[in-house]
Amino acid sequence: TPLGPKWPEPVFGRLASPGFPGEYANDQERRWTLTAPPGYRLRLYFTHFDLELSHLCEYDFVKLSSGAKVLATLCGQESTDTERAPGKDTFYSLGSSLDITFRSDYSNEKPFTGFEAFYAAEDIDECQVAPGEAPTCDHHCHNHLGGFYCSCRAGYVLHRNKRTCSALCSGQVFTQRSGELSSPEYPRPYPKLSSCTYSISLEEGFSVILDFVESFDVETHPETLCPYDFLKIQTDREEHGPFCGKTLPHRIETKSNTVTITFVTDESGDHTGWKIHYTSTAQPCPYPMAPPNGHVSPVQAKYILKDSFSIFCETGYELLQGHLPLKSFTAVCQKDGSWDRPMPACSIVDCGPPDDLPSGRVEYITGPGVTTYKAVIQYSCEETFYTMKVNDGKYVCEADGFWTSSKGEKSLPVCEPVCGLSARTTGGRIYGGQKAKPGDFPWQVLILGGTTAAGALLYDNWVLTAAHAVYEQKHDASALDIRMGTLKRLSPHYTQAWSEAVFIHEGYTHDAGFDNDIALIKLNNKVVINSNITPICLPRKEAESFMRTDDIGTASGWGLTQRGFLARNLMYVDIPIVDHQKCTAAYEKPPYPRGSVTANMLCAGLESGGKDSCRGDSGGALVFLDSETERWFVGGIVSWGSMNCGEAGQYGVYTKVINYIPWIENIISDF
């Protein structure tokens, strides 16, 4: 029997009946065995076919078989109902070998020319399977010349049988307090030859509850308990299962915080698997009862391990643990069923006793000593001598625990001294130096420190004076002895004040004229204002209208009198303002240098002399009455004059205060 070529030779060729293309003889039998390489098959087709036709091809025939299977028995020239001729058909071996048998019987009614066929090896596409047949590979099939290989989707690994995809379904750890887990691909059929391990691992104190949901379908056996595929549940206390079949297992209350679920499958079957919804529970904590005037959030039916609640107080109430304030409060339920901290109180906000108001008082409006939320107090300043600055003095205890004004201020109001009050009323005429009476010049300050000088009280902690009067003490402010509230220079009854700092105008040059002869003394404490101690006002912008030529100002002090001694009693003199040009001219004659009188000075006195300030009065105020406000203000500071006080044709020269308002305001606001 002729054999066809064998692999590894090239597998292709031609076959023909004996004597082809001539007629074939009777009683012939010829057999060809063709063999292709592994992974290949043989393809065969006829280019000529002419055999005797007989019922079921019993006489002459060509038979094609592959292994034990007959692929075709062929005869005739064209197919009939019961016989088959190849026509244009192509025949394929089932494996890598193909047997071709030609036979002719003892006679032919007429001559037949037989057949001619061509064959070739071709790659088998193992990935192509007939409908109804099991697929070659579980997931992906890849054909190549001479063979194929299988691969798997992500999450699977190829089994050692090289065709099955086993699920990579181990090592998943669930740590949430509830969740779902299921067999791979659920609700589609689960993979074969897989071993899955799932862990639920919760914090100590939790207990896992397992509920099987939706459907349960795991391959089973009628007699043996889960021999093929099975599901097992293991805790540190006990094992549940194995489970298989189609019935949903009952709820499992594990009483454990750790659970291991094992699912094992074999190589066969087509089942949808399972789905578990797990929850957890723990020993509940006592139900939190909100404190009065507070509420709990969130509200839950019960609170278990790790659950928490916060307390929020109503407006006007605050969280307190005893006397200690808390901005927020959150308690967490512990594994032993207790809260990690005790419940605070929501106490009504208490703003506490209001601060004392210097030079003022406070009145409880809501009720005596009531300082809690929404309570009202009223600050007021001591009448006559103080006035309230900025607000109306009404404060409310707000939810933040601070007394707050109607303008939203949390700071105290300020009682500012009333300035420019005097017991004295001025007349229009000029008369000689007079003794001052109590309350006439309550701003008058006596400055002792090397020499005797004067000053005027501003606000309740500043003194306005002349630079030349305190120049020597500018670096030793504490050396200044400052007295006020007295008329008698040598009286032991006075209010003592001490200097904290001396501010001399930066434009003042000592012993080189008296331009910018102005200074401020900051007192180290505020003085109490009364009828004998009251500040002088600073001039308003409009003050120039009360300081024109011939307007009357009043100078006061303990300076030299006509007798040549310092006055024992405070003296004052009413003097008119002198025309500036006239004054300038008066001091242009020797011994005075040109330019002695500057625009920062004003002059006052009589042309005839006799009324003047003198040594010892330096730094004191030349004051004027503002007829609109009915308050006295400082227009000048006693600065310099002729060597002989009260000399005819000479005048007292005063620092013009209105030129220095910005300087004064800056110093006071900065310090």
Epitope: Q321, G322, L324, P325, K327, D340, P342, G352, F402
Partner: antibody, heavy 116, light 107 residues
Framework: DVQLQESGPGLVKPSQSLSLTCTVT?????????WNWIRQFPGNKLEWMGY???????SYNPSLKSRISITRDTSKNQFFLHLNSVTTEDTATYFC?????????WGQGTPLTVSS | DIVMTQSQKFMSTSVGDRVSVTCKAS??????VAWYQQKPGQSPKALIY???YRYSGVPDRFTGSGSGTDFTLTISNVQSEDLAEYFC?????????FGAGTKLELK
């Protein structure tokens, strides 16, 4: 990590004023709780002086109310103790501490001697 | 002012013993009491707050109990590092006050 650190002069003369600073790191003094000054006298007796709360409100020991003031600088996360008219009786180690529910931290303390 | 009385200035103990430090308030302070441990040259360290709640990091051999006026700090299985002074502290009302301290020492 919450840390408190006191700083101050160490020695003060009688009748003078005392100022101490507590610098806080690791937590904002405006976030929560009460920020306290506590002192420990020789012999280990502890005395609470007062606190300034997260909101800036103060509470003082009535025995010191006329002399004490507690303030803060939120930009520097510091709070301060001011004590006027000190006497030798104020000689102690001064601690700043935050006291609150489940939140308790103390500084190392700064010794103060009042002596002429 | 609420006076916190620690009647025992000193207590002698041995390693492994159980010891109870007591504190009595002059008036009701609810459970607003803390316990502190202080070692020489160190600042006080909080052990217990609100009478019975242990601060994290504090060994569970320290337990606090009581409410109202009577409070106890119990140390079971005393260790050598527990030898220190213990203060009770009420934070119920102004002024906050401390006990005078109880010194734990070895027998």
């Amino acid at each position: 990590d919450v840390q408190l650190q006191e700083s101050g002069p160490g020695l003060v003369k009688p009748s003078q004023s005392l100022s101490l600073t507590c610098t806080v790191t690791g937590y904002s003094i405006t976030s929560d709780y009460a920020w306290n000054w506590i002192r420990q006298f020789p012999g280990n007796k502890l005395e609470w002086m007062g606190y300034i709360s997260y909101s800036g409100r103060t509470s003082y020991n009535p025995s010191l109310k006329s002399r004490i003031s507690i303030t803060r600088d939120t930009s520097k996360n510091q709070f301060f103790l001011h004590l006027n008219s000190v006497t030798t009786e104020d000689t102690a180690t001064y601690f700043c501490a935050v006291l609150g529910l489940y939140f308790d931290y103390w500084g190392q303390g700064t010794p103060l001697t009042v002596s002429s | 002012d609420i006076v916190m009385t620690q009647s025992q200035k000193f207590m002698s103990t041995s390693v492994g013993d159980r010891v109870s430090v007591t504190c009595k308030a002059s008036q009701n302070v609810d459970t607003n009491v803390a316990w502190y441990q202080q070692k020489p040259g160190q600042s006080p360290k909080a052990l217990i707050y609100s009478a019975s709640y242990r601060y994290s990091g504090v060994p569970d051999r320290f337990t606090g109990s009581g409410s109202g006026t009577d409070f106890t700090l119990t140390i079971s299985n005393v260790q050598s590092e527990d030898l220190a002074e213990y203060f009770c502290h009420q934070f119920n009302s102004n002024p906050l006050t401390f006990g005078a301290g109880t010194k734990l020492e070895l027998k």
